[in-house]
């Protein structure tokens, strides 16, 4: 085994290096000392380190680790942050377009419904946006509310235009009749299925991306234990105490130390891999009724078809509703 | 089917070509993200190696530091000795992950469970009871726009997907994004605390 080079007789080199870490030289001994108070860089002979220096080295070592982790994750972190923002904005744009398409459909096909229809459509798509962002809203309730609100307007404006406008009583009756008589056929149910499936997938996709950011942020700002700090100090800095400024840690030794320091972090690996593969599976399935872009941008067409369905059955419906809501109508005419 | 407002739709055939050839849709953007994420699948298992390769480690030198003394790079002492008679490395590993790491692992387990549930083939079938009402089924031929759910569901024709991604500012500055602390980028030879 090669003998270690003689320690720096004056600790001059150690002092000039340590000054970069900690301006002010009072902690560095002038000449090598026994170092009996040292706890990490345990000396085999005289040493150029003091207890205070050791503490500073430990702090620096842990800081190095944090910086290295941040540099490792920089590209990945940007990738997820950027995409989470892009997709969130993209989904909002889809919702905005879907609302515009639906409003345009009403304006062009049913101008008499527009003022109220615009209001109901607006509320529906606001709820859609909130749901995607994680709000606790029930999709079926959203769809029911849209059709419950639309039917009284359709009935009073398209099917039975002779009725007075502000028939609050009849409105309540019409809302109830809408569900009981399946006025819109199976269209509401169809929309519920498609909207709930596509929005659920979209919402989980966004949640997953946001969790990705959280995972990277957590490892980015990990605080390493005292034990780890001691191991790092011993590896990176204890050689300086012997005046061995140009010597580097052995590769195998570094790997052993890192396995110890990073044991907890490496435990994330299994779940991280699963996260990426599960996200891939989800994305592969995001088409047709699982693709909110497809579903929401086609919604105006389904709503249009549902109104046509009502119009086709207008005769039958008017008679039935006439009987069913007669009481409300009489009260109103009085 | 519904009237398409002129200001919202370009000629369908033109749009179809654009869609197939150039259009960057949400779906292609999602696939691209997954492919990028797959690059980082070994991120956590490779971290220890990254730290060692980005901090000063003896590569070409004959002698290296093992935590206690100077040794020859390929001797058995190169990895072992620095650990002896000091605190127990095994003990450090046994302590288990930090609470924050355990917490993030739990969150990952939860989202993975959700993602798997959503991806289950069972959930992929369009509810059959949707054709009970016997709606008129329309043409969904090759020339048509994609029909969701096949016949019997009110034949929803979906117009080709938006080119709305053009509206997106792709130059999203990471400084403005959530959860980003603007740290100075440490380059391996510029970490001031390492002496080269």
């Amino acid at each position: 085994q090669p003998p270690p080079p003689p320690p720096d007789a004056t600790c001059h080199q150690v002092r000039s290096f340590f000054q970069r870490l900690q301006p002010g030289l009072k902690w560095v001994p002038e000449t090598p000392v026994p170092g009996s108070d040292l706890q990490v860089c345990l000396p085999k002979g005289p040493t150029c380190c003091s207890r205070k220096m050791e503490e500073k080295y430990q702090l620096t070592a842990r800081l190095n680790m944090e910086q290295l982790l941040q540099s490792a994750s920089m590209e990945l972190k940007f990738l997820i942050i950027q995409n989470a923002a892009v997709f969130q904005e993209a989904f909002e744009i889809v919702v905005r377009h879907a609302k515009n398409y639906t409003n345009a459909m009403f304006k062009n096909n049913y101008p008499s419904l527009t003022p109220q229809a615009f209001e109901f459509v607006g509320e529906f798509f606001t709820d859609v946006s909130l749901y995607i962002l994680g709000s606790d809203i029930n999709v079926d309730d959203m769809v029911n509310e849209l059709f419950d609100s639309l039917f009284p307007v359709i009935y009073t404006q398209l099917m039975n235009p002779g009725l007075p406008d502000s028939a609050l009583d009849i409105n309540e009756c019409l809302r109830g009749a809408r569900r009981d008589l399946k006025v819109f056929g199976n269209f509401p149910k169809l929309i519920m299925t498609q909207v709930s499936k596509s929005l659920q997938v979209t919402r989980i996709f966004l949640q997953a991306l946001n969790l990705g950011i959280e995972v990277i942020n957590t490892t980015d700002h990990l605080k390493f234990s005292k034990d780890c700090g001691r191991m790092l100090t011993r590896m990176w800095y204890c050689s300086y105490c012997q005046g061995l400024m140009m010597v580097k840690p052995c590769g195998g030794y570094c790997n052993v130390v890192m396995q110890g320091c990073m044991a907890g972090v490496v435990e994330i690996d299994k779940y991280w891999r699963e996260y990426i593969l599960s996200l891939e599976e989800l994305v592969n399935g995001m088409y047709r009724i699982y693709d909110m872009e497809n579903v929401l941008l086609g919604l105006f067409s389904t709503i249009h078809d549902s109104i046509q369905y009502v119009q086709k059955n207008a005769g039958k419906l008017t008679t039935t509703i006439g009987k069913l809501c007669a009481h409300s109508q009489q009260r109103q005419y009085r | 089917s519904a009237y398409y407002p002129e200001d919202l739709f370009i000629d369908k055939k033109v749009l179809k070509v654009a869609h197939v050839e150039h259009e960057e849709t949400l779906s292609s953007r999602r696939r691209e993200l997954i492919q990028k994420l797959k690059s980082f699948i070994s991120f956590y298992s490779a971290l220890p190696g990254y730290i060692c390769s980005h901090s000063p480690v003896a590569e070409n030198d004959t002698l290296c530091w093992n935590g206690q003394e100077l040794v020859e790079r390929y001797s058995q002492k190169a990895a072992r000795n620095g650990m002896k008679n000091q605190f127990n490395l095994h003990e450090l590993k046994m302590k288990g992950p930090e609470p924050v790491v355990s917490q993030i692992i739990d969150k990952l387990k939860h989202i993975n469970q959700l993602l798997r549930t959503m991806s289950m083939p069972k959930g992929r079938v369009l509810d059959k009871n949707l054709d009970e009402e016997g709606f008129e089924s329309g043409d969904c031929g090759d020339d048509e726009d994609e029909c969701i759910g096949g016949s019997g569901d009110g034949m929803i024709k979906v117009k080709n997907q938006l080119r709305f991604l053009a509206e997106l500012a792709y130059d999203l500055d990471v400084d403005d994004a959530p959860g980003n602390s603007q740290q100075a980028t440490p380059k391996d030879n510029e970490i001031s605390t390492f002496h080269n």
Epitope: A72, S73, M74, E75, L76, F78, L79, Q82 | E32, Q35, K36, K38, S39, F40, I41, S42, F43, S45, A46, Y50, Y170, D171, T185, K187
Partner: antibody, heavy 119, light 106 residues
Framework: QVQLQQSGPELVKPGASVKISCKAS????????MNWVKQRPGKGLEWIGR????????NYNGRFKGKATLTVDKSSSTAYMQLSSLTSEDSAVYFC????????????WGQGTTLTVSS | DIQMTQSPSSLSASLGGKVTITCKAS??????IAWYQHKPGKGPRLLIH???TLQPGIPSRFSGSGSGRDYSFSISNLEPEDIATYYC????????FGGGTKLEIK
């Protein structure tokens, strides 16, 4: 450490096909994209395509669709690129290159395989 | 497809001097640019990724900067072993190399 060892030089006739190999070692082969890059004599680098050994997912540069086919053999950690209907335009040095773990850039490269197409 | 325009295509500089190479992308590439050194008969060597992050073992004489569509790469204190061809690579949307810059020492 990461190493990519490519097969030796090839001299083939126009119209024929050739299969170049790239044996990987020193890392988890299945978890990194393997890319292929072309360099014609005196010219720059041109990306051909990539394959993800874990699931066989591929992307190609449009100019090489139908020309190059990428495959892998996970059991031997080897990536292959088959080039078909060869012409003199295909004479070049072909590199395999690994997609990084901490970056999506190509971080380790093979030494290159020289392909000469001549009758 | 994203195009990368690299300039100059060749340059000559003195030992100890500084050189700068630029790459312009046809669209914003979100800092996803890498720089390579390529010597004849070898595979290219990654020097810098993500605009400015140095690979391990690469001296700090090499540096990179930029954002959006415009990026630059510099070598200061030129040494004889820096003679090579240098390439930029965008990896925001698959991969596109710049045309290359051949560096010679005066």
């Amino acid at each position: 450490q990461v190493q990519l060892q490519q097969s030796g030089p090839e001299l083939v006739k126009p119209g024929a096909s050739v299969k170049i190999s790239c044996k990987a070692s020193g890392y988890a082969f299945s978890s990194s994209w393997m890319n292929w890059v072309k360099q014609r004599p005196g010219k720059g680098l041109e990306w051909i395509g990539r394959i993800y050994p874990g699931d066989g997912d591929t992307n190609y540069n449009g100019r090489f669709k139908g020309k190059a086919t990428l495959t892998v053999d996970k059991s031997s950690s080897t990536a292959y690129m088959q080039l078909s209907s060869l012409t003199s335009e295909d004479s070049a040095v072909y590199f395999c290159a690994r997609g990084g773990v901490f970056t999506m850039a190509l971080d380790h490269w093979g030494q290159g395989t020289t392909l000469t197409v001549s009758s | 497809d994203i195009q990368m325009t690299q300039s100059p295509s060749s340059l000559s500089a003195s030992l100890g001097g500084k050189v700068t190479i630029t790459c312009k992308a046809s669209q914003d590439i979100n800092k996803y640019i890498a720089w390579y050194q390529h010597k004849p008969g070898k595979g290219p060597r990654l020097l810098i990724h993500y605009t400015s992050t140095l690979q391990p073992g690469i001296p700090s004489r090499f540096s990179g900067s930029g954002s959006g569509r415009d990026y630059s790469f510099s070598i200061s204190n030129l040494e004889p072993e820096d003679i090579a061809t240098y390439y930029c690579l965008q990896y925001d949307n698959l991969f596109t190399f710049g045309g290359g810059t051949k560096l010679e020492i005066k």
